[in-house]
Interface confidence: low
Amino acid sequence: MRTEAQVPALQPPEPGLEGAMGHRTLVLPWVLLTLCVTAGTPEVWVQVRMEATELSSFTIRCGFLGSGSISLVTVSWGGPNGAGGTTLAVLHPERGIRQWAPARQARWETQSSISLILEGSGASSPCANTTFCCKFASFPEGSWEACGSLPPSSDPGLSAPPTPAPILRADLAGILGVSGVLLFGCVYLLHLLRRHKHRPAPRLQPSRTSPQAPRARAWAPSQASQAALHVPYATINTSCRPATLDTAHPHGGPSWWASLPTHAAHRPQGPAAWASTPIPARGSFVSVENGLYAQAGERPPHTGPGLTLFPDPRGPRAMEGPLGVR
């Protein structure tokens, strides 16, 4: 098992951001700040942004930094999945992707991060302060969930600012960081901050909801905020609830399973079929060493788009081939 710390990848720079202030110089401190704030904890990050071109269209991006194998990602809105939230998409590393309106496109960005684009029309369209949650099931670490939303005053095209805070539903002790790298990063961050005192930057303030970690204050649109990070532990509670979807999901989960070609008989109809989206190669994963778990190699990539699926009334858990049909 490799022991380097995985640094959250940066979002591609916005058009026209290559300004005089220096894109790279602005971004690096916030990467390091994110690392310093969240060092030593399992990291799930959520980023929500409203598209500038379609004001009611949202992009949700989520990622997981841990040492286990991701076995499932569930994206929900209106609250955590299973606690009042409604499932928007389910992504399995080998078996494919399912999504429900108003989700337009769910996909893997890397082997440990996903993105979801939501349509912005109709009764089920999200409102600006809807909470979106991402839940990662990792073997054997268990399940981790983080939630996030756009600040009410966000301008279109902007991402939610970094808002590190502990997840209420995080059920496992912290995953160990790589202290040497982080220590160097934090020292370097302080050095950078001292050099760039004259530049406006977001100020950290203690979170009112949790004394354990700081929460960043939203700031005015700037090049720094537009070059936003993937943010661990974005938990912003909102009062806005989405309209009920056309395909109802009892217990906050999806009404599973389309009628697909299968050897199994008597399967119920479901709202949609799995998308046979090719899964990106998984060779770039860098894991954090965790003394709790057995050392093991990386999961090999699933290279083909053809996914053999076996729907079952019990839902996705019952499909043949728990870790993917290889």
Epitope: G82, E141, G142, G321, G324, R326
Partner: antibody
Framework: EVQLVESGGGLVKPGGSLKLSCAAS????????MSWVRQTPAKRLEWVAT????????YYPDTVKGRFTISRDNAKNTLYLQMRSLRSEDTAMYYC?????????????WGQGTSVTVSS | QIVLTQSPAIMSASPGEKVTMTCSAS?????LYWYQQKPGSSPRLLIY???NLASGVPVRFSGSGSGTSYSLTLSRMEAEDAATYYC?????????FGAGTKLELK
């Protein structure tokens, strides 16, 4: 029909070794994560080990780590549990379990169990 | 590790009676599983992910709960339901089971 048939149990002295086997049929064995779960004489269920499919990762609770080794032979559709340095508290009925981790980690298929008694 | 405490340890119910048993976790868990074990048999998956019925399980069984408090409800007791019921979690390493609730037919 899914079938998991355990074998290899028996009476062994403390400090001894034993190797359990589990023959699987009726499902795509190579695609399933597999576990061993034991049930003590007091009827408590205890997770013993898990092995994933494909990348063959193995996981153990601290109580057996370093003493027990789970392995699989996908060509033979067989799961194994090598037990060393056995203790009296390892006395139990050992179940071979197939579990679909697609949604999380419930255990779908259970064998009938094989009894292990550690006693001098 | 997360300790699951099931209560009551033993209970009895008459045919047609509604039965509820609980599983309390020492720390918050995301999902819970329930198994049924009849005398002389292996455990059988009953409910997965807190509230979803496994294949072939009668609809009189239902599961609910969140956080640290979960329950298994049997809407109408039948003779074949006499068994021991175990809860299990894997929200946190290691996987753990409850000690079980023995349901007897009155």
């Amino acid at each position: 029909e899914v079938q998991l048939v355990e074998s290899g149990g028996g009476l062994v002295k403390p400090g001894g070794s034993l190797k359990l086997s589990c023959a699987a049929s009726g499902f795509t064995f190579s695609s399933y994560a597999m576990s061993w779960v034991r049930q003590t004489p007091a009827k408590r269920l205890e997770w013993v080990a898990t092995i994933t499919s494909g990348d063959i990762r193995t996981y153990y609770p601290d109580t057996v780590k370093g003493r027990f080794t789970i392995s699989r032979d996908n060509a033979k559709n067989t799961l194994y549990l090598q037990m060393r340095s056995l203790r009296s508290e390892d006395t139990a009925m050992y179940y071979c379990v197939g579990h679909d981790d697609f949604h999380f980690y419930a255990m779908d298929y259970w064998g009938q169990g094989t009894s292990v008694t550690v006693s001098s | 590790q997360i300790v699951l405490t099931q209560s009551p340890a033993i209970m009895s119910a008459s045919p047609g009676e509604k039965v509820t048993m609980t599983c309390s976790a020492s720390s918050s868990v995301s999902y819970l599983y329930w198994y049924q074990q009849k005398p002389g048999s292996s455990p059988r998956l009953l409910i997965y992910d807190t509230s979803n019925l496994a294949s072939g399980v009668p609809v009189r069984f239902s599961g609910s709960g969140s956080g640290t408090s979960y329950s298994l409800t049997l809407s109408r007791m039948e003779a074949e339901d006499a068994a021991t019921y175990y809860c299990q979690q894997w929200s946190s390493y290691p996987l753990t089971f409850g000690a079980g609730t023995k349901l007897e037919l009155k």
